[in-house]
C-alpha cells in the first residue's frame, strides 16, 4: 500500500511540476522592466521565452513576437532548448508512468515490468525538473549580470519575473516527483529479488540455506503481487489564466 | 456613444469642500481609467490625477495629493472628484477624461467651472 | 517630473498654409520595449475641451483629417498641419504620456489671418 501511495503521489506531484513547466515556458513575464529606478512609469515593459510585451497605464497590452530565431541572443536560446527537453521528458515520463501505475491494471504486465517503467519515468522526472531548473537559473543569472552591469543602461536593466518562480517550483516538484517514482520502483521489484541466499560456513564445510519460512522486509511495504488493488486514479485538472493588471505601474 | 457628463458649474465658499462629478455613459465603466484634468483661465492643462473605477486604484500628481481625492460610484457609473479647503487658486475648469491608447485621452467631458468665492 | 516646452507660443498663418510646431520634452518619451514615443497632441478650440489629434506622436486617432501629422522621436517631436483651414484655429498642446505625473506643454495658438 505505501508502494502504491508513493508511486501515486509521485506521479501527481510531477504532473503538477510539468504542467507548472509548461506554464512557465508559455508565460510573458520572464524579466519584467525595473520599477525600483523607474518608479513612476506609465509603461510597463515585460519579456518571455517567445515575445516582448507593453503594458500601458490605460490598461492597453501589446505583445510581439520575437520572429527571428539568429537574431536571438544565444542564452535565449539555450534557455528555451533547456525548457523544451525539460517539458518533452516530462511529458514522456507521464506517458511511462501512467502505465506504471500499480493501480491501472494493463493485461498481465509483470511488476517487475511496472518496476522498470517506474524507474524510466522517475529518471525522466528528475532530468525533467533539472532541465527546468538549470533553464529558469541561466536567464536569472543573466539578468542579475545585466543588472550589475555599470554598461548597461539603466532602461535596460530587468527583474526577476513571475515566470522563472514559477519555474524553480515547478522544476522542483517535478524532481521531487522523480525521486518519490524511483523509491517506488524500489518496492515494486517482484518477490525473487527481494530474497538472497544466505550461506553458512560451519566446522570446515560449507552448507548454504535458503531460507522459506520468513521474507527479507525492504521496509517499502508488503508485496502485493497477488493482490487487487482499488485505488482511484488521481485527476488534475490545470487552468493557467492571465489577466492584466493595472498595478504593475506604481 | 461615448459620454462624460459633468455639471457646467459649482459655486463653493473658501475653506468647505467641494465634490465635482462626472456620469460615463456609452461604454463598460469600470474597464478604463478616468483621469482629472485643471484648467485655470487663460492657462495651460494639469493632470490631477486618475482612478481605475474597477477597484477604485488612483495615481496622484503630487502637487494635488493633499488637494483632491477622487473616487467612484459604480452603481451609477460616475466617477468623483472632491477638493479640500479650496482656495482662488482652486477657480479653473476641471475636465473628466477616458484613458486611451498611448495613455492619451480620448473623451472629455464638457468641463466643471468652479469659482472660489465668498 | 518631464517638463514639456512648445515654441512658438503663438503662430497666425493663411488658410491654405503649411503649418508646423515644436514640442520637446525634458527626458525621452521613447519607449524600448515596444519603439514607441508616448507624446501625444490635443487640439482645443475656444470654449471647448481639448480633443485628441495624435497618440504614440504619430497615430492619427480615427476621424482626425489626414492634413495633421505627428513626428518626432525620443524628446523632440512636431505637429505639422499640412494645408490649414479656418476651423483649425485652436491652441495645441503636446502631453507627455510616458511617465506620472502626465504633463503639457504650455499651449501654442494658432490663428488665422
Known amino acids: 500500500m505505501a508502494v502504491t501511495a508513493c508511486q501515486g503521489l509521485g506521479f501527481v506531484v510531477s504532473l503538477i511540476g510539468i504542467a507548472g513547466i509548461i506554464a512557465a515556458t508559455c508565460m510573458d513575464q520572464w524579466s519584467t522592466q525595473d520599477l525600483y529606478n523607474n518608479p513612476v512609469t506609465a509603461v510597463f515593459n515585460y519579456q518571455g521565452l517567445w515575445r516582448s510585451c507593453v503594458r500601458e497605464s490605460s490598461g492597453f497590452t501589446e505583445c510581439r513576437g520575437y520572429f527571428t530565431l539568429l537574431g536571438l541572443p544565444a542564452m535565449l536560446q539555450a534557455v528555451r532548448a533547456l525548457m523544451i527537453v525539460g517539458i518533452v521528458l516530462g511529458a514522456i515520463g507521464l506517458l511511462v508512468s501512467i502505465f506504471a501505475l500499480k493501480c491501472i491494471r494493463i493485461g498481465s504486465m509483470e511488476d517487475s515490468a511496472k518496476a522498470n517503467m517506474t524507474l524510466t519515468s522517475g529518471i525522466m522526472f528528475i532530468v525533467s525538473g533539472l532541465c527546468a531548473i538549470a533553464g529558469v537559473s541561466v536567464f536569472a543569472n543573466m539578468l542579475i549580470q545585466d543588472f550589475y552591469n555599470p554598461l548597461v543602461a539603466e532602461a535596460l536593466k530587468r527583474e526577476l519575473g513571475a515566470s522563472l518562480f514559477v519555474g524553480w517550483v515547478a522544476g522542483g516538484l517535478t524532481l521531487i516527483g522523480g525521486v518519490m517514482m524511483c523509491i517506488a520502483c524500489r518496492g515494486l521489484a517482484p518477490e525473487e529479488t527481494n530474497y538472497k541466499a544466505v550461506s553458512y560456513h560451519a566446522s570446515g564445510h560449507s552448507v548454504a540455506y535458503k531460507p522459506g519460512g520468513f521474507k527479507a522486509s525492504t521496509g517499502f511495504g508488503s508485496n502485493t503481487k497477488n493482490k487487487k488493488i482499488y485505488d482511484g486514479g488521481a485527476r488534475t485538472e490545470d487552468e493557467v489564466q492571465s489577466y492584466p493588471s493595472k498595478h504593475d505601474y506604481v | 456613444q461615448v459620454q462624460l457628463q459633468q455639471p457646467g458649474a459649482e459655486l463653493v465658499r473658501p475653506g468647505a469642500s467641494v465634490k465635482l462629478s462626472c456620469k460615463a455613459s456609452?461604454?463598460?465603466?469600470?474597464?478604463?481609467?478616468i483621469n482629472w484634468v485643471k484648467q485655470r483661465p487663460g492657462q495651460g492643462l494639469e493632470w490631477i490625477g486618475n482612478?481605475?473605477?474597477?477597484?477604485?486604484?488612483?495615481n496622484y500628481n503630487q502637487k494635488f495629493k493633499d488637494k483632491a481625492t477622487l473616487t467612484v460610484d459604480k452603481s451609477s457609473s460616475t466617477a468623483y472628484m472632491q477638493l479640500s479647503s479650496p482656495t482662488s487658486e482652486d477657480s479653473a475648469v476641471y475636465y473628466c477624461?477616458?484613458?486611451?491608447?498611448?495613455?492619451?485621452?480620448?473623451?472629455w467631458g464638457q468641463g466643471t467651472t468652479l469659482t472660489v468665492s465668498s | 517630473d518631464i517638463v514639456m516646452t512648445q515654441s512658438p507660443s503663438s503662430l497666425t498663418v493663411t488658410a491654405g498654409e503649411k503649418v508646423t510646431m515644436s514640442c520637446k520634452s525634458s527626458?525621452?518619451?521613447?519607449?524600448?520595449?515596444?519603439?514607441?514615443?508616448?507624446l501625444t497632441w490635443y487640439q482645443q478650440k475656444p470654449g471647448q475641451p481639448p480633443k485628441l489629434l495624435i497618440y504614440?506622436?504619430?497615430t492619427r486617432e480615427s476621424g482626425v483629417p489626414d492634413r495633421f501629422t505627428g513626428s518626432g522621436s525620443g524628446t523632440d517631436f512636431t505637429l505639422t498641419i499640412s494645408s490649414v483651414q479656418a476651423e483649425d484655429l485652436a491652441v495645441y498642446y503636446c502631453?507627455?504620456?510616458?511617465?506620472?505625473?502626465?504633463?503639457f506643454g504650455s499651449g501654442t495658438k494658432l490663428e488665422i489671418k
Open positions: 482612478i481605475y473605477p474597477s477597484d477604485s486604484y488612483t
Open positions: 477624461t477616458r484613458s486611451w491608447r498611448g495613455n492619451s485621452f480620448d473623451y
Open positions: 527626458q525621452s518619451l521613447l519607449n524600448s520595449g515596444n519603439q514607441k514615443n508616448y
Open positions: 504614440w506622436a504619430s
Open positions: 502631453q507627455n504620456d510616458y511617465s506620472y505625473p502626465f504633463t
Open positions: 456609452g461604454y463598460t465603466f469600470t474597464s478604463y481609467w
